[in-house]
Interface confidence: medium
Amino acid sequence: FDLVDYEEVLGKLGIYDADGDGDFDVDDAKVLLGLKERSTSEPAVPPEEAEPHTEPEEQVPVEAEPQNIEDEAKEQIQSLLHEMVHAEHVEGEDLQQEDGPTGEPQQEDDEFLMATDVDDRFETLEPEVSHEETEHSYHVEETVSQDCNQDMEEMMSEQENPDSSEPVVEDERLHHDTDDVTYQVYEEQAVYEPLENEGIEITEVTAPPEDNPVEDSQVIVEEVSIFPVEEQQEVPPETNRKTDDPEQKAKVKKKKPKLLNKFDKTIKAELDAAEKLRKRGKIEEAVNAFKELVRKYPQSPRARYGKAQCEDDLAEKRRSNEVLRGAIETYQEVASLPDVPADLLKLSLKRRSDRQQFLGHMRGSLLTLQRLVQLFPNDTSLKNDLGVGYLLIGDNDNAKKVYEEVLSVTPNDGFAKVHYGFILKAQNKIAESIPYLKEGIESGDPGTDDGRFYFHLGDAMQRVGNKEAYKWYELGHKRGHFASVWQRSLYNVNGLKAQPWWTPKETGYTELVKSLERNWKLIRDEGLAVMDKAKGLFLPEDENLREKGDWSQFTLWQQGRRNENACKGAPKTCTLLEKFPETTGCRRGQIKYSIMHPGTHVWPHTGPTNCRLRMHLGLVIPKEGCKIRCANETKTWEEGKVLIFDDSFEHEVWQDASSFRLIFIVDVWHPELTPQQRRSLPAI
């Protein structure tokens, strides 16, 4: 919709909804940018170290900074802030109206693109959660740890997260499934999730079972890479690779942030005492201590910032969205106080932006990032964050401008390069995207070691006939983004048997295969009838997977949901399939007819998940010219026969016959997934 239907939500779901957002129907819980339409909760545990590291290269050397920052720059900052503070003041409010909360609606609902509100993006699932599924996430490494000051002015990046120099925002178990059509379109390509939330400690994160009944509170986690959970850290691997680089070290150690103004230095002992409580994890006591300091010293930026951090910590501890909204508001208050040290201002607004993203307040986060860039125009990393902010709301054009600007000033910025390449690829500027993606990944800069960049670099290279593609897939595999060079899906459950081609016996779904093969003519005839009478039900593939040709699909089920309208066109086929929950209940797949016309070539591509296997039943197969390659083995279809392959492996299709090819595609759960996993895995 365009809006959440709160009448449907309130009173029916309880405070914490297993799928963590606001969908109208639990079985229809689809996530858009981490949100759905119905529930009043959203999973996502904020990270342990939540505060962004300051951008060292941006800070003025300590010696150079006036004691109380009462120079022109400070005045500019203050006037800019006062101008902008009011524009965003309401964001933290949580207005409860008759038909539900509207203060800071969270995201677009995937049906009507209406604003939605979600009461809690912190998951309250039971602790016994299995952590088996790996999900590729989008990282932008965190730049300042939440404990950004040990002795108020110590450079925390040296203590806690020595090598980061970009803000981390990592997609946090929020799956963003678009509407059905879009998913039909996306289903054969890895789905790229937004950089919504901050880097999390994977071992603590739970994934929402997006499509399941609310009662299913145990969930499978999709981890950030294919390594075992224990190996996951908040600090992404590329930052570690950079530690030996003296330049990088120099960058990080350039300057300690100045967090105290003249007045705060006079109350440093009190601030230290309160901070010590927070550092020791005595959050409630720390909150009270900082509240008291704010009461006593309402103009103290550092006291206010401490209060914000405590609220932030408390929100994490209680998994409370309401508390986090308060923290976001308090970070804002820091910025509106007089005489705020530039470093503290930056930390506070960066953290605010990050937490806004965590809550799905993408637009609000973007406004905060815009303010940051206005306040600190020379900080490249903030511009990079701003670019991501634009990407998160689908504004590729503005993101592109931002990265062009960054690259005009710092042509070797790897983060800007990969993102710029990413945007070019999205615009189908395949050849142009390659050098940016390649050089960006090669830079090793924080935020560049992301599976999607390898995925798209390889894909771009394949499309221009560059054999180097597999070198990058290999590297992506080595760095933990892909299960193997061939198997490059990004939503994976670890440990599932991985082979490109399967026999019916190996799947265990022999009854389904038999039924399909016995009834193939019935299935074929219904498909042909739809082609004749309601051709419009066959929707063209528009995911840019084709080099050339004509390929359309008519979908009966997707995300485990029957399309009633479609089933009117193929009623017997739908009835036949109802007996097989391994396919009708496969929320990570579809059941559909696929028609491909002569002269079609589908680029090598990879499906999004290893959780399904794909059956192809031949319905109308020309004598010659039609073939499918999965990994390094190529096969042909036969009428009335089922082929089974794992589409998380690279596959490619050719249709060089003289007439159309019609097949019936039936996705099934990977046989090794447990019933619990099948219930809990979020839909794709």
């Epitope: 409010e93 963003h176 678009t178 509407d179 637009r363 689908g394 990413f422």
Partner: antibody, heavy 127, light 106 residues
Framework: QVQLVESEGGVVQPGRPLRLSCAAS????????MHWVRQAPGKGLEWVAV????????RYAGSVKGRFTISRDNSKNTLYLQMNSLRPEDTGVYYC????????????????????WGQGTTVTVSS | IVLTQSPATLSLPPRERATLSCGTS??????LAWYQQKPGRAPRVLTY???NRAAGTPARFSGSGSGTDFTPAISSLEPEDFAVYYC?????????FGPGTKVDIK
């Protein structure tokens, strides 16, 4: 090019039904939620109803709830508004409008306003 | 959510700056769009989500505000800008338009 064309409206007596249609062309109709918006003579715009991209969900303004039904046929690229129990206050120009959306690998999609409108069709409810 | 727009009519000469106003009875955050309608024509979207210009919207149009108060502006009125302007919220059901502000030539 991208366009929406409403069917002819007409004059109808109070209490009688009328069905409006809106033919879409130049874009993937089945990917977009669609709205009906109306405008009484000399008055402002009034939102009427919306239907999801696949026709599975709809919402209505209080003034038309229970009387009007929005639907779509994606195979025909057509949006409908079935108006029953018409009243004189339903008189006006009825517009169909598309919900703009964009997608990319980061955000999947994002709202762009009601970005394409039909030319409007006049409905007059009078005895 | 009730939307109010002021003034009902704004009479200005060309090349002058026009500032409109839209208020909402509840916080709609940034979920507010502006539409322009000329006599006998369908509306067209100018900005969505407060400040984002739609494709084809000239740079002289800008939007600002958040929560309950919004003020779009036209930096320098062109002859083609004289029209009725509507704000619309999508923060909660039912979606609603404001009553409109007519910008006419002084």
């Amino acid at each position: 090019q991208v366009q929406l064309v409403e069917s002819e409206g007409g004059v109808v007596q109070p209490g009688r039904p009328l069905r409006l249609s809106c033919a879409a062309s130049g874009f993937t109709f089945s990917s977009h939620a669609m709205h009906w918006v109306r405008q009484a003579p000399g008055k402002g715009l009034e939102w009427v109803a919306v239907v999801s991209h696949d026709g599975s969900r709809d919402r209505y303004a209080g003034s038309v709830k229970g009387r009007f039904t929005i639907s779509r046929d994606n195979s025909k690229n057509t949006l409908y508004l079935q108006m029953n129990s018409l009243r004189p206050e339903d008189t006006g120009v009825y517009y169909c409008a598309r919900v703009g959306r964009s997608s990319n690998w980061f955000s999947r999609y994002y709202y762009y306003g009601m970005d394409v409108w039909g030319q409007g069709t006049t409905v007059t409810v009078s005895s | 959510i009730v939307l109010t727009q002021s003034p009902a009519t704004l009479s200005l000469p060309p090349r002058e700056r026009a500032t409109l106003s839209c208020g909402t009875s509840q916080n709609v955050s940034h979920y507010l769009a502006w539409y322009q309608q000329k006599p006998g024509r369908a509306p067209r979207v100018l900005t969505y989500d407060v400040a984002n210009r739609a494709a084809g919207t000239p740079a002289r149009f800008s939007g600002s505000g958040s929560g309950t108060d919004f003020t779009p502006a036209i930096s320098s009125l062109e002859p083609e800008d004289f029209a009725v302007y509507y704000c619309q919220q999508r923060s909660n059901w039912p979606q609603a338009f404001g009553p409109g502000t007519k910008v006419d030539i002084k």
